[in-house]
């Protein structure tokens, strides 16, 4: 169909800062240290290519990537198709976050990434430590009291947790823009549901207890017509596409080399096991440490606590896809009525999980709406 991919895009070997400057945008790179010692790279695009002269404070927009991904998700397409560049050109101060364990957040003050201890985290810790540290840093650096938060996939999950459990952090969020939101995954069609009955001991036995590599577990589900086509062989061995699903019709196939070289960006086996627990329970709750005794040590209760999104009063706008395997429309349907301050919702019938970051028509379907909503907020 597309033949073998030849790495034609220079961004294949670039880091985040290089990708930003390659397209002629200003870039600032910072290191944020979390309370538990993780060092997260944060990038800033303070203005666009044509509006550097505009003085005065620009509204701050913080973009948080999803599962198995990194900040490169927001800058992997051409500038007119990448949300980070679109926002910068629209006059906003754009910040890109990274979650612990990914390519750009794989250091810790106390633990080496070679140690099991480094990888003992799930999305709980991303919400409890990574988001507050990054948002506090941005607030201090910009001198602005509030920012706009854009999350995709797990980036929405950690937003739901952080903004419903940490009221002082929630006050810092002007609006939450949720793309392919994930709270419960009761109805997910993603291949992670194949893992839901694998006990923890076997899960660790198969995948290890550090960084998550898909191993050969998923091969048995991929021998389909879809995966036998030439171009898709490359996608079928990639954990991000395996877990999230894909639809080549909406991709700019000339950018596939960039997507594949930067993804999966890495997460912990514990995080992936947390997601399988969520599929099995159908609930939105903290990591289950495997026994009442261990749960008591972590939570002072025998069962992991539930996350209550009804406690999140941040204004939220939601976009979801009708063909999304991970953020299934039925799960989104359960989520929406629980959001006390839902200001906008749009379901895009033909969108899948990754279309929100990479689809060729994402500006028309999603990004332009975000830009206008932020500019309305300015008034």
């Amino acid at each position: 169909l597309f033949g073998k991919l030849h790495p034609g895009s220079p961004e294949v070997t670039m880091n985040i800062s290089q990708m930003i400057t390659y397209w002629g945008y200003p870039n600032e790179e910072y290191e944020v240290v979390t309370e538990d010692g993780y060092i997260l790279e944060v990038n800033r695009i303070p203005y666009g290519k044509k509006n550097s002269g505009n003085t005065g404070q620009r509204p701050v927009v913080f973009l948080q990537h999803g599962l198995l991904a990194s900040a490169t998700n927001w800058i992997s397409n051409l500038p007119n198709n990448s949300l980070a560049f679109i926002l910068a050109d629209a006059g906003y101060d754009v910040w890109l976050g990274n979650s612990r364990g990914n390519t750009w957040a794989r250091r810790n003050l106390y633990y080496s990434p070679d140690s099991v201890e480094f990888w003992a985290f799930s999305f709980d810790e991303m919400a409890k430590y990574d988001l507050p540290a990054t948002i506090d840093f941005i607030v201090k650096k910009t001198g602005q009291k509030q920012l706009h938060y854009v999350g995709h996939s797990q980036g929405t999950t950690i937003g739901f947790i952080a903004f419903s459990t940490n009221p002082s952090l929630a006050k810092r969020i002007k609006t939450f823009y949720a793309l392919a939101p994930v709270a419960t995954v009761k109805y997910t069609k993603s291949l992670i549901n194949k893992l839901r009955f694998v006990p923890q001991s076997l899960f660790k036995f198969i995948f290890g207890d550090k960084i998550f590599y898909p191993h050969n577990f998923f091969d048995q589900f991929l021998a389909t017509e879809v995966c036998s086509r030439e171009m898709l062989n490359l996608l079928c061995s990639n954990a991000l596409f395996i877990i999230c699903g894909f639809d080549s019709k909406n991709f700019n196939t000339s950018r596939l080399d960039v997507y594949l070289s930067h993804n999966p960006a890495g997460t912990s086996v514990q995080n992936m096991f947390h997601w399988t627990q969520a599929v099995k329970s159908g609930k939105f709750q903290a990591y289950d440490w495997g026994s009442p005794v261990q749960n008591r040590m972590h939570y002072d209760q025998s069962q992991p606590p539930y996350y209550n999104v009804t406690a999140m009063n941040v204004p939220i706008a939601v976009w979801n896809g009708g063909k999304d395997l991970l953020a299934d429309p039925q799960d989104v349907g359960l989520l929406l009525p629980k959001l006390p301050n839902l200001i906008y919702h749009k379901e895009i019938p033909f969108y899948n999980h990754l279309d929100f970051i990479w689809a060729m028509d994402a500006p028309q379907e999603v990004y332009n709406d975000i830009v206008s909503m932020i500019s309305e907020d300015k008034k």
């Epitope: 694998v198 076997l202 198969i206 050969n216 577990f217 048995q220």
Partner: nanobody
């Protein structure tokens, strides 16, 4: 509900071999993972060999190169070939299967390796 039943355990001398079988009441072809666990005296049950539906295998370091996991989908049976047995291999061996409907355990079979 798939029922699993192990057989082939027993008493064997160090250096000897055993072949454990795990017969399933239903199809094992639909199992995503078939695995063998060992519970050594006074210890927790832990996985020692796993076989994915794709055919790929994983072994615990302690058995690597000595044990081989396999399955015969037509006979709905999984096997564990154990060679060069040592007293440390003594314990109850359980077979398990994980599929779309759940995770299933056998009752276990005792293996004792004497020195």
């Amino acid at each position: 509900q798939v029922q699993l039943q192990e057989s082939g355990g027993g008493l064997v001398q160090a250096g000897g071999s055993l072949r454990l079988s795990c017969a399933a009441s239903g199809s094992i072809g639909s199992m995503y993972v078939m695995s063998w666990y060992r519970q050594a005296p006074g210890k927790e049950r832990e996985p020692i060999a796993a076989l994915m539906g794709s055919g790929s295998t994983t072994y615990a370091d302690s058995v690597k190169g000595r044990f081989t996991i396999s399955r015969d989908n037509e006979k709905n049976t999984m096997y564990l070939q154990m060679n060069s047995l040592t007293p440390e291999d003594t314990g109850v061996y359980y077979c398990a299967g994980t599929g779309a409907e759940g995770h299933y355990w056998g009752q276990g079979t005792q293996v004792t390796v004497s020195s």
